[in-house]
């Protein structure tokens, strides 16, 4: 009996036309939602004038349906048993699952001012930028609608820059009508233990963002893993959102709609400093902000964001060192709400439920040549927003799963 089940599973998880896995892989049958909480700055003037702590108040959720589009340009390569594809991006606002509208206003860091002062450290260039910032009546903080902040707006300061720069700014700009990839993954035909594991991303086996092994593209995209998952495994996956590969470890057994699943979580060790976890040494790319690589819980992904000083963390700086959050008031990290987990059905390796949580922050530094940043006395890693992307297998699919997979085994 077990051999027959193994044989069936091996056949059905292969990523090729006609299998159960392929149908669900092309276009997920699970509804995926991305909830955003925006950090509304309560004291912009005091920060700018006195270098006070930034007082934030999170507002949300603002919910979007995401990943509803089928994979595109799916191409099988029988020579190396891979399948390549693009993952199109799309987001549809869900008013009934949100606390307000996309027109809601927020006081947030001026993304362009913070980024420009970082990208152009040349003091004379900063003098030029200062004149343009003043001319455009821009400041350290700005008021933007949710739609503008997430999906993009034309920045008045950047519009005055005589040098060819993109004048549109947004935390996820551009998003709609774009695609992630090309991904090339193993289809599992020759070896089921490699199914869904990424061979190349954008035509390369490395990212070119990090040194050494940190730069590797490891594992799958976390939507599924090779079958017959063991609790002792360390599940590697690549997330283009955070520009790196990361891993999850077994935490507990969970019953999901009658299906036994393994809950894998991202451990705090994955966010540790090289002092605590030497394996992370190559994720520390600079010495000043990281306090000689002793800070933890934030990842500088500026190299992956055209030099913009973007830092990724867990929401509310969960698992981050005290020095990171000491300049921010109003944060309440909570493991249950703010960690990332994957609920994996171990026989098939399918992720049947997940919650991906991350926070996007921007570094802003004092600049004696830019008036609106001149009175700052310290660096700030400013939280802009955090997101919770979730998906849970639907009731019908769960029923099918119980009858065709777990039921047969039990």
């Amino acid at each position: 009996g077990d051999m027959l089940i193994q044989k069936t599973i091996k056949k059905e998880v292969v990523l090729e036309e006609g299998t159960i896995a392929f149908k669900n892989w092309v276009k997920t049958g699970t509804e995926i939602y991305r909830q955003f909480w925006i950090f509304d700055v309560q004291n912009p003037q005091e920060v700018m004038m006195n270098s006070s702590n930034i007082q934030v108040k999170q507002r949300g959720p603002y919910t979007y349906r995401v990943r509803f589009l089928a994979k595109e340009n799916i191409t099988q390569d029988p020579k190396d048993n891979t399948v390549s594809f693009l993952q199109p991006n799309g987001a549809i606002f869900e008013p009934s699952l949100s606390v307000g509208t996309e027109a809601d206003n927020f006081t947030v860091l001026n993304l362009a001012v913070a980024a420009a002062s970082h990208i152009y450290p040349n003091p004379f260039v900063q003098v030029v930028l200062n004149s343009l910032i003043n001319k455009s009546k821009s400041s350290m903080f700005q008021v933007r609608t949710l739609r503008e902040l997430l999906w993009g707006y034309t920045d008045p300061f950047l519009s005055l820059v005589p040098y060819p720069v993109s004048t549109r700014v947004g935390m996820f700009y551009p998003y709609n009508n774009t695609a992630d990839g090309v991904y090339k993954v193993f289809n599992g035909k020759d070896s089921i233990s490699k199914v869904a594991i990424i061979d190349t991303y954008k035509g390369k086996r490395n990212l070119s963002y990090w040194e050494s092994y940190c730069d590797m593209i490891n594992g799958t995209d976390a939507a599924s893993f090779p079958p017959f998952v063991e609790k002792s495994q360390v599940l590697q996956f690549f997330s283009s959102d955070i520009c790196r590969s990361i891993y999850a470890v077994f935490e507990s057994d969970v019953n999901l709609k009658g299906i036994p699943v393994y809950r894998f979580v991202l451990p705090s060790k994955a966010f540790a400093s090289p002092v605590q976890n030497p394996d992370n040494h190559c994720f520390c790319t600079e010495k000043i902000i990281s306090k000689n690589c002793t800070s933890y819980g934030v990842l500088d992904i500026s190299k992956c964001k055209e030099g913009k000083p973007v830092y990724i963390s867990l929401p509310h700086f969960l698992y981050a060192s005290p020095d990171v959050s000491e300049t921010i008031d109003g944060l309440n990290p909570n493991e249950e709400e703010h960690r990332t987990y994957l609920d994996i059905e171990p026989i098939t390796g399918f992720t049947l439920q997940f919650a991906k949580r991350l926070q996007v922050n921007l570094l802003v530094k004092p600049s004696n040549k830019i008036q609106v940043l001149k009175r700052l006395k310290r660096n700030y890693i400013v939280p802009i927003l955090w997101l919770n992307e979730t998906g849970t297998i639907g009731d019908e699919k769960a029923k099918m799963f119980r009858s065709q997979v777990t039921g047969k085994i039990n």
Partner: antibody, heavy 118, light 104 residues
Framework: AVTLDESGGGLQTPGRALSLVCKAS????????MFWVRQAPGKGLEWVAG????????LYGAAVKGRATISRDNGQSTVRLQLNNLRAEDTGTYYC???????????WGHGTEVIVSS | ALTQPSSVSANPGETVKITCSGG???YGWYQQKSPGSAPVTVI????KRPSDIPSRFSGSASGSTATFTITGVQAEDEAVYYC???????????FGAGTTLTVL
């Protein structure tokens, strides 16, 4: 030694255009911002224009804004100041200067004299 | 423009201090020995001295005020000294009107 040599001055007619060139040597020209500073007879120093190390960003003093263009050729180690619609008050000695990297001059040229007169 | 005294005088060997205010940061001090002669940088970036400038010349800055000091002034130091910096309310670099140093 750092050397900055200006040329292109002389007697000019009001309303016409002027082109001053500064030839640099003795340092890695492409690593420095460059400025033009002028001094009217019997007066103090006045900042005219600046350009960043790769020529992307420029800035002009209020008196010449809209009439001046500063440009550079890193291959030739030269910086140029084009000044249009000359006026009598543009008369003076024009100095090429090197920015130390913090909008603070650390080297000057010998200057080229410009006289605007009909 | 930056504000500096129009003139100061001192006996040889004395210490001379010239202040400059109104700029935002990174001051420089420029010596001009005669009208029409090229200025010479004696201090740049507040306190840095070019290698060919004697150690009696020094500079410092605190807040929006810079101070230029000649410790043990000599006859050949007689000149006009201009401070230069960046004025945040103005787009670009600015200079003071110059301080004439007379060595008695």
């Amino acid at each position: 030694a750092v050397t900055l040599d200006e040329s292109g001055g002389g007697l000019q007619t009001p309303g016409r255009a002027l082109s001053l060139v500064c030839k640099a040597s003795g340092f890695t020209f492409s690593s420095y911002n460059m400025f033009w500073v002028r001094q009217a007879p019997g007066k103090g120093l006045e900042w005219v224009a600046g350009i960043d190390d790769d020529g992307s960003f420029t800035l002009y003093g209020a008196a010449v804004k809209g009439r001046a263009t500063i440009s550079r050729d890193n291959g030739q180690s030269t910086v140029r100041l084009q000044l249009n619609n000359l006026r009598a008050e543009d008369t003076g000695t024009y100095y090429c200067a090197r920015d130390s990297g913090a909008v603070s001059i650390d080297a000057w040229g010998h200057g080229t004299e410009v006289i605007v007169s009909s | 423009a930056l504000t500096q005294p129009s003139s100061v005088s001192a006996n040889p060997g004395e210490t001379v201090k010239i202040t400059c205010s109104g700029g935002d940061s990174d001051y420089g001090w420029y010596q001009q020995k005669s009208p029409g002669s090229a200025p010479v940088t004696v201090i740049y970036q507040n306190d840095k001295r070019p290698s060919d400038i004697p150690s009696r010349f020094s500079g410092s800055a605190s807040g929006s005020t810079a101070t230029f000091t000649i410790t043990g002034v000599q006859a050949e130091d007689e000149a006009v000294y201009y401070c230069g910096g960046w004025d945040g309310s103005y787009d670009g670099a600015v200079f003071g009107a110059g301080t004439t140093l007379t060595v008695l």
